[in-house]
Interface confidence: medium
């Protein structure tokens, strides 16, 4: 729980399609993509690997063949089940030396329509370098989308795009502890469009969740819940058609 987090000082827009390895290291970052126009990327996310990061590990690849914008998502049934047996998911906040969540994933729901609201189990909680990917299409005339990373009855991270809050589009992030919502963090950059496909990627970092939408970095949310291994479920709800929800280690 160090104080010296890097928040989203670092937003792409510098012309580097893969600043500091986020998110192009695993996405299909289109040319020229990059979050907030005009924002600089001044060597941000200290301690993170430089561009072209994660040496020696193959990038997770590009979901070839999925419907619409996400060519090539695996066919139904392709995702293997998560590892089983004692010790597969250590309770510490960091992966073990042998690789708690092996990088072989992804694990989760097979591609194809999923019933919303949908719960994606995260059996060992979340750990740094874990990447959660959600593919779907926003329904026409959508009102809201919600991702809820849940720790028992608490919501460690609530990611809530709102399509019409007082005639404005806004993304609200928050945490619910003891049945009380905390202080909201609001983001006016809004990459979702009614009727259009989307890809949400949530990367777990030691100090924060990092969110990218359609391969562009969107926001960062500092952890307000310390024991990441207790965040054991992701709830996905709202006005979407959900194609797939999965996680892997990068």
């Amino acid at each position: 729980m160090a104080d010296n987090f890097s928040l989203h000082d670092a937003l792409s827009g510098s012309g580097n399609p893969n600043p500091q390895g986020w998110p192009g290291a695993w996405g299909n970052q289109p040319a020229g993509a990059g979050g907030y126009p005009g924002a600089s990327y001044p060597g941000a996310y200290p301690g993170q690997a430089p561009p072209g990061a994660y040496p020696g590990q193959a990038p997770p690849g590009a979901y070839p063949g999925a419907p619409g914008a996400y060519p090539g998502a695996p066919a139904p049934g392709v995702y293997p089940g998560p590892p089983s047996g004692p010790g597969a998911y250590p309770s510490s906040g960091q992966p073990s030396a042998t690789g708690a969540y092996p990088a072989t994933g992804p694990y989760g729901a097979p591609a194809g329509p999923l019933i919303v609201p949908y719960n994606l189990p995260l059996p060992g909680g979340v750990v740094p370098r874990m990447l959660i990917t959600i593919l779907g299409t926003v329904k026409p005339n959508a009102n809201r989308i919600a991702l809820d990373f849940q720790r028992g009855n608490d919501v460690a991270f609530h990611f809530n795009p709102r399509f019409n809050e007082n005639n404005r589009r806004v993304i609200v992030c928050n945490t619910k502890l003891d049945n009380n919502w905390g202080r909201e963090e609001r983001q006016s950059v809004f990459p979702f469009e009614s009727g259009k496909p989307f890809k949400i990627q949530v990367l777990v970092e030691p100090d924060h969740f990092k969110v990218a939408v359609n391969d562009a970095h969107l926001l960062q949310y500092n952890h307000r819940v310390k024991k990441l291994n207790e965040i054991s479920k992701l709830g996905i709800s709202g006005d979407i058609d959900l194609t797939s929800a999965s996680y892997t280690m990068i």
Epitope: M1, F5, L7, L177, D178, G182, R183, R224, K227
Partner: antibody, heavy 122, light 111 residues
Framework: EVQLQQSGAEVVKPGAPVKLSCKAS????????LNWVKQRPGRGLEWIGR????????HYNQKFKDKATLTVDMSSSTAYIQLSSLTSEDSAVYYC???????????????WGQGTSVTVSS | DIVLTQSPASLAVSLGQRATISCRAS??????????MNWFQQRPGQPPKLLIY???NLESGVPARFSGSGSGTDFSLNIHPMEEDDAAMYFC?????????FGGGTKLEIK
């Protein structure tokens, strides 16, 4: 209702230690940092340090590193501060304050105890 | 350590008028567009009460006559219109990094 109930006033001899308590109620104790703040008359407020009850992680103001020790008792939702080798400079009101997790560890101190007066006198 | 310099040390304002208290930090309190400056009110014999967090966010239950502004190194607390109940000490405090520090305080009185 969130409440932080602090122990009563103390009069302590120079060189002696003292241990103050702060009992939390109305929220889940291990979800929030617990801060300690010193206030001397006419000398403003000084942040001593904080403790995370979930795992007893502590962050201290270096100025108080050798003076204060922060601990918690999870079973009773109580935080403690032990002050060692007291001198007249330690005469003050000591407050505990809950640290909200807004923006991670940088959240504001949103609920405060009523304070404990410590007087160092021979 | 980050030093917070608060001014004025004391201030007398007529009821219904505006009170402005300033706080200058020895280095920027900004991180990613968020300014980690908080404001507290303290009445005699009571603990400090959070009024404003992250420079401009009004704490729940605090009257809207209180407002905060600023970024980087310069911040201010405004009270308008001044009410009798507002006579108190006011402190700025940063939470950008450990150790957290407070300003020296401003004593606000009714003129």
């Amino acid at each position: 209702e969130v409440q932080l109930q602090q122990s009563g006033a103390e009069v302590v001899k120079p060189g002696a230690p003292v241990k103050l308590s702060c009992k939390a109620s109305g929220y889940t104790f291990n979800n929030y940092w617990l801060n300690w703040v010193k206030q001397r008359p006419g000398r403003g407020l000084e942040w001593i340090g904080r403790i995370d009850p979930s795992d007893s992680e502590t962050h201290y103001n270096q100025k108080f590193k050798d003076k204060a020790t922060l601990t918690v008792d999870m079973s009773s939702s109580t935080a403690y501060i032990q002050l060692s080798s007291l001198t007249s400079e330690d005469s003050a009101v000591y407050y505990c304050a809950r640290g909200d997790y807004y923006y991670g560890t940088r959240g504001p101190m949103d609920y405060w105890g009523q304070g404990t007066s410590v007087t160092v006198s021979s | 350590d980050i030093v917070l310099t608060q001014s004025p040390a004391s201030l007398a304002v007529s009821l219904g008028q505006r009170a402005t208290i300033s706080c200058r930090a020895s280095e920027s309190l900004d991180n990613s567009g968020i300014s980690f400056m908080n404001w507290f009110q303290q009445r005699p014999g009571q603990p400090p009460k959070l009024l404003i967090y992250a420079a401009s966010n009004l704490e729940s239950g605090v009257p809207a006559r209180f407002s905060g502004s600023g970024s980087g190194t310069d911040f201010s607390l405004n009270i308008h219109p001044m009410e009798e109940d507002d006579a108190a000490m006011y402190f700025c405090q940063h939470s950008k990094e450990v150790p957290w520090t407070f300003g020296g305080g401003t004593k606000l009185e009714i003129k």
